[in-house]
């Protein structure tokens, strides 16, 4: 097991998560860790407990390697980190990696007020319900956005946009949480129309498809839990 | 659907050594990942050792040099050959396994492993 120490000098490996770092209850999930050529192990943390390790064999690339993750459960939902070892030097540790697990227990209503097709400027709101008590709400626009919105409710919660934009228009589904990383079923979708303005915008964004292997995010923690943040499609971290 | 069953286990004087079995059934073994975990009375379940489905091993390190795990893949079955035992190793032993896993991946944490035995009884004392 790695040691801490004061003197790692190896630059941190990048970590991500394979198709997505939301991964539906029993289902499984990769997560890469890229380090360096001369990596002779790599490990995998937990939650700050030692998860895994893998030594790449000289006969394939050394510098990443993969953890399997078998079935995706609230016990495997949290933060990852990786860190590897080259000679007897060790690296820092990746930047975290935030898994959540989906498709617990319960499944959230979600409507639109007024309506799901407004006019540019007016005001809408989202609410989510969920009957089992629950300590947040997620709100989660699908393809195309970045944004996570979250809110403190009992069952129910309520997303304001303000006056909406054309850069609303989308789908939107929401989740309630039992804690951070363990999510409820998701709601069925919603879609948000916008129309008016210079151009006819009502038509939704052509989307093959509504999976959620499709959503493009990153979870990041704040005082108050997740927020927004920007990620690309592999969900990596790193700088 | 995997069932492990482990065997071997039973009384023994500090310094002996007990070899542990672990049977697993159906036609998955070779692309499972082994463990073998323990918990003794009143305390947490802790690592012992770990096998990846390629045969690269770890060991916790209150065992690292007198445990030896190791696997049969025609029989399905894992091994675990305990020696120089100590009265702290006094334990239930419980086989686990990853199942499927991915090449060389050994696996340290109980939250990984998707299947478990009932466990056997090691006592070591004079």
């Known amino acids: 097991q790695r040691i801490n120490t004061e003197k790692e000098t190896l630059p941190k490996p990048i970590i991500w998560a394979k198709p997505s770092i939301m991964v539906t209850n029993g289902n499984s999930v990769n997560i890469w860790c890229q380090g360096a050529q001369s990596a002779s192990e790599y490990q995998l943390y937990f939650e700050g407990s030692f998860f895994a390790l893998e030594r790449p064999k000289p006969s394939r690339s050394m510098n990443k390697v993969r953890f399997f993750i078998s079935q995706m459960t609230s016990h495997t939902a949290g933060i990852y980190t990786c860190f590897y070892q080259s000679g007897e030097l060790w690296s820092k540790s990746s930047n975290p990696l935030k898994l959540v697990v989906t498709g617990l227990y319960d499944t959230p209503n979600l409507w639109v007020y007024p309506r799901p097709e407004v006019t540019l400027g007016e005001n809408v709101t989202f609410f989510c319900q969920l009957k089992t008590a629950t300590s947040k709400f997620f709100l989660l626009k699908e393809r195309g956005s970045n944004h996570i919105q979250n809110k403190y409710g009992n069952i129910q919660a309520e997303f304001p946009m303000g006056p909406v934009t054309r850069a609303h228009r989308g789908t939107y589904r929401c989740f309630g949480s039992y804690n951070d990383y363990a999510w409820s079923f998701p709601s069925e979708p919603v879609t948000l129309l916008i129309t008016g303005g210079v151009e006819n915008s009502s038509l939704a964004p052509t989307d093959p498809t509504s999976s959620l292997d499709y959503w493009e995010f990153d979870l990041s923690t704040n005082e108050s839990g997740l927020q927004k943040d920007s990620a690309f499609w592999d969900h990596t971290t790193q700088n | 659907e995997v069932q492990l069953v482990e065997s071997g286990g039973g009384e023994v004087q500090p310094g002996g050594s007990l070899r542990l079995s672990c049977a697993a059934s159906?036609?998955?073994?070779?692309?499972?990942?082994m463990g073998w975990f323990r918990q003794a009375p009143g305390k947490e379940r802790e690592f012992v050792a770990a096998?990846?489905?390629?045969?690269?091993?770890y060991y916790a390190e209150s065992v690292k040099g007198r445990f030896t795990i190791s696997r049969d893949n025609a029989k399905n079955t894992v091994y675990l050959q305990m020696s120089s035992l100590r009265a702290e190793d006094t334990a239930v032993y419980y086989c686990?396994?990853?199942?499927?896993?991915?090449?060389?991946?050994?696996?340290?944490?109980?939250?990984?492993?998707?299947?478990w035995g009932q466990g056997t009884l090691v006592t070591v004392k004079p």
């Open positions: 686990a396994a990853v199942v499927p896993t991915y090449g060389s991946n050994i696996y340290v944490h109980s939250a990984a492993y998707n299947y």
């Open positions: 159906g036609r998955t073994f070779a692309s499972a990942a």
């Open positions: 096998i990846s489905r390629s045969d690269d091993t």
